[in-house]
C-alpha cells in the first residue's frame, strides 16, 4: 500500500477588530476567512509544482478579535496605528508551532499600496515560511516566522474579493518560497507584445493586479521552480495528509451539521461546540432547526429567518438576497442586466459581477493612459478606452475622441485601482502612486532583525 501524501498545509487565521468592524458579525468574518482559504486552495491544488500536486489548505483554528477586544490588553492587534512591518511582527511574536502558516486579516490602509506582507521560505538555512518553528532571534525575542498578514483596504477603498484572494495567494506564495516575479518570461504584463501583455501578470508580480486577467491567478514558471524546491525540502516537516474536516475551525465542512468553534469561542445556542464528545460535537442541539454557523438566514434562537428577511444587500450587479424560510443559506439572487454601470460608473456588470470596463459598453476596450506612451501624468487615474486591439487610439474618457460616448465627462478610476500599466495604485487625489515593492524591506533594515534575515521578508 502506498502511504498517503502529506499535502495539506494547516492554517491558523486571526482577524483583528478592524476586520470585524468592517464585516459586522462573526459569521460574516468566518465567511470571509472561508472564501479566502477556498480561493487559495483552488489555485494551489490546480498547480503542478514540478511533480508535487494537490497542495491544499485547511483551517485548523481561527481567532476573531471583535470590537469588544479593542481594549483587551491580551489582544496584540488592538493598536490603531501600526505600520505593516510592525503588524507582521505582532503576529510573529506569537508561538505558531502547531501550524504550517499563521495569518492575520485586517482592514487597515497601510502606506504605499501595500496589501500584504509575509516571510519568504527557502529550501535550506531559511528563517521564515512554511513549517518554520518559533525560535530566539538576535533582538532577544522568540518569533514564529511561518507568518503573514493581509489587508482588504487600499487608499481608502476596499479591494474586490478577487484581488484580496490573489493577495492571499501571493503572500502564501512568499511563505512557500517564491520571490517576486522578474524577467520577461515571468512578467508578460510588462511586455511590448500585445498578445502576451493582454493575459496580464502572474500571482507573484511585485506591483498591482486587477485580478481579472488570465494569468492573474496562476503561478509563473519562476514561482513554480522556487516553490517546488521549498516543498521538496519542507513539506514533510509539518504538512499533513488531507482528509477529515476539523470540527472547531468555525467552518461547516463535509459531515458536520454546524461549527461554532471550541468552547471558549462558541457563542451559539444551537450547536454543540468542538470540546463536546465525539458523537455530539459539530452537531445541532436537539430541537434546533439551524445554527448561525450554517448561514445568515438562521437566527440566534436557532430558527430559520422568515421569508421576507434580507440576507444580502442589493449590489451594483445583483438584486438583494432574501431568506426563504426553510434554509440557513442566503439564496442566490438574480443578476442585474449586463452592461449596467457599476463601481461608480467605471465598470459594467457582466453576469451579475462587476467585471467589465465601462469602455465595453461602447464596444471599446480599456487601456492604460501610461506615462511611457508620453501621456500626461494627470491622466494615469482616468478611465481610458481604445478601439479593440488598437493601442494608438487609447485616450481618456474625457477626451474629444470619445466625447460621443462620454460627452466630455472624465471618468476617474476608484482610489485603490491599478494604474500606469499595473505599476501602481490611484490614491484619493487621483494620483498614480507607484508601488515600492520592497519598501518594507528597506525599513526593516533599520529595525530589529539581524542582517541575514533581510532577504526573507517580502510584500
Amino acid at each position: 500500500t502506498t502511504s498517503a501524501e502529506k499535502n495539506t498545509c494547516q492554517l491558523y487565521i486571526q482577524t483583528d477588530h478592524l476586520f470585524f468592524k468592517y464585516y459586522g458579525t462573526r459569521e460574516a468574518v468566518i465567511a470571509q476567512i472561508s472564501s479566502h482559504v477556498k480561493a487559495i486552495d483552488t489555485i494551489y491544488q490546480t498547480t503542478d509544482f514540478s511533480g508535487i500536486r494537490n497542495i491544499s489548505f485547511m483551517v485548523k483554528r481561527i481567532r476573531i478579535n471583535t470590537t469588544a477586544d479593542e481594549k483587551d490588553p491580551t489582544n496584540p492587534f488592538r493598536f490603531p496605528n501600526i505600520g505593516v512591518e510592525k503588524f507582521l511582527e505582532l503576529n510573529s511574536e506569537q508561538n505558531h508551532d502547531d501550524y504550517c502558516l499563521a495569518y492575520v486579516f485586517t482592514d487597515r490602509d497601510f502606506d504605499d499600496g501595500v496589501l500584504g506582507l509575509a516571510w519568504v521560505g527557502a529550501p535550506s538555512g531559511s528563517s521564515g515560511g512554511i513549517c518554520e518553528k518559533s525560535k530566539l532571534y538576535s533582538d532577544g525575542k522568540k518569533k514564529s516566522l511561518n507568518t503573514g498578514i493581509i489587508t482588504v483596504q487600499n487608499y481608502g477603498s476596499h479591494v474586490p474579493p478577487k484581488v484580496s484572494h490573489i493577495t492571499f495567494a501571493h503572500e502564501v506564495g512568499h511563505n512557500f518560497g517564491s520571490p517576486h516575479d522578474s524577467g520577461t518570461e515571468c512578467t508578460p504584463g510588462e511586455s511590448k507584445n500585445l498578445g502576451q501583455k493582454e493575459n496580464g501578470n502572474y500571482i507573484m508580480y511585485a506591483r498591482a493586479t486587477s485580478g481579472d486577467k488570465l494569468n492573474n491567478n496562476k503561478f509563473s514558471l519562476c514561482s513554480i521552480r522556487n516553490i517546488s524546491q521549498v516543498l521538496e525540502k519542507k513539506r514533510n516537516n509539518c504538512f499533513v495528509e488531507s482528509g477529515q474536516p476539523i470540527c472547531g475551525n468555525g467552518m461547516v465542512e463535509q459531515g458536520e451539521e454546524c461549527d461554532c468553534g471550541y468552547s471558549d469561542q462558541c457563542k451559539d445556542e444551537c450547536c454543540f461546540d468542538a470540546n463536546q464528545p465525539e458523537g455530539r460535537k459539530c452537531k445541532l442541539k436537539p430541537g434546533k432547526q439551524c445554527s448561525p454557523s450554517q448561514g445568515p438566514c438562521c437566527t440566534a434562537q436557532c430558527a430559520f429567518k422568515s421569508k421576507s428577511e434580507k440576507c444580502r444587500d442589493d449590489s451594483d450587479c445583483a438584486r438583494e438576497g432574501i431568506c426563504n424560510g426553510f434554509t440557513a443559506l442566503c439564496p442566490a439572487s438574480d443578476p442585474k442586466p449586463n452592461f449596467t454601470d457599476c463601481n461608480r460608473h467605471t465598470q459594467v456588470c457582466i453576469n451579475g459581477q462587476c467585471a467589465g470596463s465601462i469602455c465595453e459598453k461602447y464596444g471599446l476596450e480599456e487601456c492604460t493612459c501610461a506615462s511611457s506612451d508620453g501621456k500626461d501624468d494627470k491622466e494615469l487615474c482616468h478611465v481610458c478606452c481604445m478601439k479593440k486591439m488598437d493601442p494608438s487610439t487609447c485616450a481618456s474618457t474625457g477626451s474629444v475622441q470619445w466625447s460621443r460616448h462620454f460627452s466630455g465627462r472624465t471618468i476617474t478610476l476608484q482610489p485603490g485601482s491599478p494604474c500606469n500599466d499595473f505599476r501602481g495604485y490611484c490614491d484619493v487625489f487621483m494620483r498614480c502612486r507607484l508601488v515600492d515593492a520592497d519598501g518594507p524591506l528597506a525599513r526593516l533594515k533599520k529595525a530589529i532583525f539581524s542582517p541575514e534575515l533581510y532577504e526573507n521578508i517580502a510584500e
Partner: nanobody
C-alpha cells in the same frame, strides 16, 4: 470560472419521476453549499432544495417528501430526484453552488414539464 450544466429535464406525466443532474468542472461541490432553484413562467426564480457545505439538506414546503437533493463528489455532480411530480412543478430548473462565498453564475437550466 465555474460552469454549471443542468440536464435530465423532460416531459413527464403527473405522478411520475425525474432525476436532474448538475455537472461542474473540478471538485467544487465538496465543502460548498449547493441549491436547486426553479423558475415557472412569469414567476420569480425560487430555491426548492439546499444542501449545506457539511451535507445537511433543506427543502421548500412545496416539495418536501417528494424531492431529494444529493451529491456525488467523485463525479462532481449534484442531483435532484423528483418523485410524485405535479403540474405545478413545471418550470426551468437550475442548480447553483457557492464558490468562495459567492453564488456562481447561472447555467442554462433544464426544462421540466409535468402534464396532467
Amino acid at each position: 470560472k465555474v460552469q454549471l450544466v443542468e440536464s435530465g429535464g423532460g416531459l413527464v406525466q403527473a405522478g411520475g419521476s425525474l432525476r436532474l443532474s448538475c455537472a461542474a468542472s473540478g471538485n467544487i461541490f465538496i465543502n460548498n453549499a449547493v441549491g436547486w432553484y426553479r423558475q415557472a413562467p412569469g414567476k420569480q426564480r425560487e430555491m426548492v432544495a439546499a444542501m449545506l457545505s457539511g451535507g445537511s439538506t433543506n427543502y421548500a414546503d412545496s416539495v418536501k417528501g417528494r424531492f431529494t437533493i444529493s451529491r456525488d463528489n467523485a463525479k462532481n455532480t449534484v442531483y435532484l430526484q423528483m418523485n410524485s411530480l405535479k403540474p405545478e412543478d413545471t418550470a426551468v430548473y437550475y442548480c447553483n453552488v457557492q464558490v468562495n462565498g459567492t453564488w456562481a453564475r447561472w447555467g442554462q437550466g433544464t426544462q421540466v414539464t409535468v402534464s396532467s
